[in-house]
């Protein structure tokens, strides 16, 4: 989690900075959304608790050809300790409903803002 260099600076990025940058990117996506995000692609919703970052990546990585979320996918990979590939789902990822990417991003953003306010950067 401390090796998140490359987003804003050349060296290791503090977790608080990395989280803030992820939040800023999600805000940017939601504010600049003109047409439906990723053509209305649907992804598995996730439980916003333990293993959230990996679960979010596992869900979003399946969407290809959507430039709007490519940076988010890269950022989330920095928070996830293991390599995630398309079609891969951990035991933490319960597949019970699919939602549009736009809603997924909004839900994730709200939760990350809450974590940031509470000082939970890891």
């Amino acid at each position: 989690l401390t090796c998140l260099g490359g987003f804003a600076s050349p060296g290791p990025v503090p977790p608080s900075t990395a989280l803030r940058e992820l939040i800023e990117e999600l805000v940017n996506i939601t504010q600049n959304q003109k047409a439906p995000l990723c053509n209305g692609s649907m992804v598995w919703s996730i439980n916003l608790t333990a293993g959230m970052y990996c679960a979010a990546l596992e869900s979003l990585i399946n969407v290809s050809g959507c430039s709007a979320i490519e940076k988010t996918q890269r950022m989330l990979s920095g928070f996830c300790p293991h390599k995630v590939s398309a079609g891969q789902f951990s035991s933490l990822h319960v597949r019970d409903t699919k939602i549009e990417v736009a809603q997924f991003v909004k839900d994730l953003l709200l939760h990350l803002k809450k974590l940031f306010r509470e000082g939970q950067f890891n």
């Epitope: 990723c38 053509n39 692609s41 649907m42 992804v43």
Partner: nanobody
């Protein structure tokens, strides 16, 4: 080019059944997870069901679980949705979709109307 053509919709009474079909072409069907998505009049898109590439694993929205059954025939590049115990709230245009690609590749859909 990805093409998806849905059929099988119609007017049915509450409690009735319909079987929707979707003919797929332009991609390697047996490698792709497939979805059924619906859109009720004046409402947003709602995920209905998903089936794994080989058809071994299926997933359903709570609203249709136990009533709808998704299946596929990879030899024919066909996707199906058997709908039993239909309710008024199931009235919608139903689309089949190549998972994770969005409505860029949706067909025209097939209208299901549940009414007495």
């Amino acid at each position: 080019e990805v093409q998806l053509l849905e059929s099988g919709g119609g007017l049915v009474q509450p409690g009735g059944s319909l079987r929707l079909s979707c003919a797929a072409s332009g991609f390697t069907f047996d490698r792709e997870e497939m979805d059924w998505v619906r859109q009720a009049p004046g409402k947003g898109r709602e995920w209905v069901s998903t089936i794994s590439p080989r058809g071994r694993t299926t997933y359903y929205a709570d609203s249709v679980r136990g009533r709808f059954t998704i299946s596929r025939d990879n030899s024919k590049n066909m996707l199906y949705l058997q709908m039993n115990g239909l309710r008024a709230e199931d009235t919608a245009v139903y689309y089949c979709a190549k998972a994770y690609t969005g409505f860029k590749y949706w067909g025209q859909g097939t209208l299901v109307t549940v009414s007495s």
